[in-house]
């Protein structure tokens, strides 16, 4: 057999057979590669639902290449059919001549029958392939219209967007001179605000000297009053004399003992000076008062005569205290006290005080905190905290706040902060917002000292979370 | 096995004293905080002192301070309570307990108690 | 001094049945909280500390939850050898305990 194509049917094949004088001529149909096999949800049509349209690289090439494999199969089965054909033919045509020639035309013609049923089979099943590619080609070239149109829609939104960064770079521009502008006014008051400052310093200096002068002066009366307690006190002894001698010399049987005028003393420094010089409770008296008041005086460290003005060892007294408590004084000299804010109030606003702040661990350290000026303001000015000068071992930071803060009480909040800090980590102090301190908070024994927000706390010395085991404050004139 | 056994309990007049013991087995005493908690009759139970491992810290309850005064001997494995100026609301079952190891207050294991009776 | 207040003060429970005991603080002891359990004539056991944690050898029924100011302890299957008084205990502030629940047979 031999293998042909007619140039004016190029898409076809002819399969000849030449058996003796007949000769068979088939027509067959041949791939031209516009087919595709039918697929099942290959991919996502709708392809306006996705941000990027789904693209499968080369699918038309992947997919013609897989039918041209399909049509070699076809063909070579079609070789192997007509293979049979000959070789049938071959015995058929032998036994034919032997029977008769005229059973020949009709057994030829039966094959051919049979031949071409099969091939009009095989061409129907190409006319299916082919549609189902005609198919898929135009779903291709609607996914590619709905990528088109998704392209020009991302196309636009990049203009409007090139055209809005284009007015926002505008109004940028525009906002840049508003604040170079606002700078230079800025410029301009930081400067005048300058001028003040310096102004103001000139005026706080000659307000310091004149402050300094009046110290001095205040001092120097301090001296000349006790200089006329001294005389006073001499002279009520040589009358309360006179007047013992006046009474013997008048009734020899009703002698009058003269009361002797007990002398009063501020603060434990004058306690200290008089001669009194063992650790104790004393009595003191508020300056240009007649009241009293009881203090623990230490007589022993760092000199002597310090007046100690809270204390905290074992957790016996409760320092969670009103505003009155806390003004006039509470728990026990000889253990655990506050000494009262308006005793050291008057007291440091006479002369210049020192404070010290004795602090212990857990863990048998000590430390000290010492101001060389301390004072509190009036109950008026809620007992306000003055502090100046930091030296000592307990932090190079003041634990009190500065520029000192007033006092504050579970039933005084005057504090910074819109919690009242007196309420949630206990005990009056000078809180701030709420500060690295409180030396009258919650007493924690040992074990239970850490991590504890509300305990006896110096921030700067053992942290936030750590509550101290014992605590001292104790003043003492600077000039001591 | 840890044990602990309490003694020196029984009547007393009010104003007396007592010397309570304990006596610890099967486990380090001077590894352990020890404390004493009392159980009134019928009624619930209340810490009434504690003593650090070395004795250098001790803690009492308001109600007994400048009265009662817990100590230890580590040596002899041992714990007191000495109780003085007795008053009829100290009569109590009185537990010695082992702190549990690192803990602030953890009563791990107790003894079986001593009754103290303050009565006239 | 921070109070312990328990409720309710007796509970009556079917034996198998489930068992909740509360717990009050007067304020925050974070989770600073245990549970002991005493029986008659003999001293406390500890069941649970830390709110949640169980002590060596206790049972699985035993659960404890809760932090802050308010805790539970539950038994979900009462054993004839769980009635008894149970007291819950802060160690956050100094010691103090609850005035117990006791729980019986119903």
């Known amino acids: 057999s031999n293998q042909r194509r007619s140039p004016e049917n190029s898409g076809r094949r002819y399969n000849r057979i030449q058996h003796g004088q007949c000769a068979y001529t088939f027509i067959l149909p041949e791939h031209d590669g516009n087919c595709r096999e039918s697929t099942t949800d290959q991919y996502n049509t709708n392809a306006l639902q996705r941000d990027a349209p789904h693209v499968e690289p080369d699918f038309s090439s992947q997919k013609l290449q897989h039918l041209e494999h399909v049509m070699e199969n076809y063909t070579q089965w079609l070789q192997k059919l007509e293979n049979y054909i000959v070789e049938n033919m071959k015995s058929e045509m032998a036994q034919i001549q032997q029977n008769a020639v005229q059973n020949q035309t009709a057994v030829m013609i039966e094959i051919g029958t049979n031949l071409l049923n099969q091939t009009a089979e095989q061409t129907r099943k190409l006319t299916d392939v082919e549609a189902q590619v005609l198919n898929q080609t135009t779903r291709l070239e609607l996914q590619l219209l709905e990528h088109s149109l998704s392209t020009n829609k991302l196309e636009k939104q990049i203009l409007d967007q090139t055209s809005e960064i284009n007015k926002l770079q505008d109004k940028n521009s525009f906002l840049e001179k508003k604040v170079l502008a606002m700078e230079d006014k800025h410029i301009i008051q930081l400067q005048s605000i300058k001028e003040e400052k310096d102004q103001l310093q000139v005026l706080v200096s000659k307000q310091n000297s004149i402050i300094e002068e009046l110290e001095k002066k205040i001092v120097t009366a301090t001296v000349n009053n006790s200089v006329l307690q001294k005389q006073q006190h001499d002279l009520m002894e040589t009358v309360n004399n006179l007047l013992t001698m006046m009474s013997t010399s008048n009734s020899a049987k009703d002698p009058t003992v003269a009361k002797e005028e007990q002398i009063s003393f501020r603060d434990c420094a004058e306690v200290f000076k008089s001669g009194h010089t063992t650790n104790g409770i004393y009595t003191l008296t508020f300056p240009n008062s007649t009241e009293e008041i009881k203090a623990y005086c230490d007589m022993e460290a760092g000199g002597g005569g310090w007046t100690i003005i809270q204390r905290r060892e074992d957790g016996s007294v409760d320092f969670q205290r009103t505003w009155k408590e806390y003004k006039v004084g509470f728990g026990n000299p000889s253990g655990e006290y506050w000494l009262g804010n308006e005793f050291v109030s008057q007291l440091t606003n006479q002369q210049r005080y020192v404070l010290k702040i004795h602090l212990k661990d857990w863990e048998g350290n000590e430390a000290y905190s010492l101001y060389e000026h301390f004072y509190l303001s009036s109950e008026e000015l809620n007992y306000r905290i003055h502090l100046k000068g930091l030296t000592g071992t307990a932090g190079k930071i003041s634990s009190i706040s500065q520029p000192g803060n007033d006092f504050s009480t579970k039933d005084g909040d005057n504090d910074k902060c819109i919690c009242k800090c007196s309420q949630m980590l206990t005990g009056g102090w000078w809180f701030d917002a709420c500060g690295p301190s409180n030396l009258n908070g919650m007493y924690y024994p040992q074990r239970q000292n850490t991590n504890k927000f509300n305990g006896i706390k110096w921030y700067y010395w053992k942290g936030s979370g750590y509550s101290l085991k014992a605590t001292t404050m104790m003043i003492r004139p600077a000039d001591f | 096995e840890v044990q602990m056994v309490e003694s020196g309990g029984g009547l007393v007049q009010p104003g007396g004293s007592l010397r309570l013991s304990c006596a610890a087995s099967?486990?380090?005493?001077?590894?352990?905080?020890m404390s004493w908690v009392r159980q009134a009759p019928g009624k619930g139970l209340e810490w009434v002192a504690n003593i650090k491992e070395d004795g250098s810290e001790k803690y009492h309850v308001d109600s007994v301070k400048g009265r009662f005064t817990i100590s230890r001997d580590n040596a002899e494995n041992s714990l007191f309570l000495q109780m003085s100026s007795l008053r009829a609301e100290d009569t109590a079952v009185y537990y010695c307990?082992?702190?549990?190891?690192?803990?602030?207050?953890?009563?791990?294991?107790w003894g079986q108690g001593t009754l103290v009776t303050v009565s006239s | 001094e921070i109070v312990m207040t328990q409720s309710p003060a007796t509970l009556s429970v079917s034996p198998g049945e489930r068992a909740i005991l509360s717990c009050r603080a007067s304020q925050s002891i974070s989770s600073n909280l245990a549970w002991y359990q005493q029986k008659p004539g003999q001293a406390p056991r500890l069941l649970i500390y830390?709110?949640?944690t169980r002590a060596t050898g206790i049972p699985a029924r035993f659960s404890g939850s809760g932090s802050g100011t308010e805790f539970t302890l539950t038994i979900s299957s009462l054993q004839s050898e769980d009635f008894a008084v149970y007291y819950c205990?802060?160690?956050?502030?100094?010691?103090?305990f609850g005035q117990g629940t006791k729980v019986e047979i119903k």
């Open positions: 205990q802060q160690y956050n502030y100094w010691w103090t």
């Open positions: 307990a082992r702190d549990m190891e690192a803990s602030a207050g953890l009563f791990d294991y």
């Open positions: 099967g486990f380090t005493l001077r590894s352990y905080w």
């Open positions: 830390g709110a949640s």
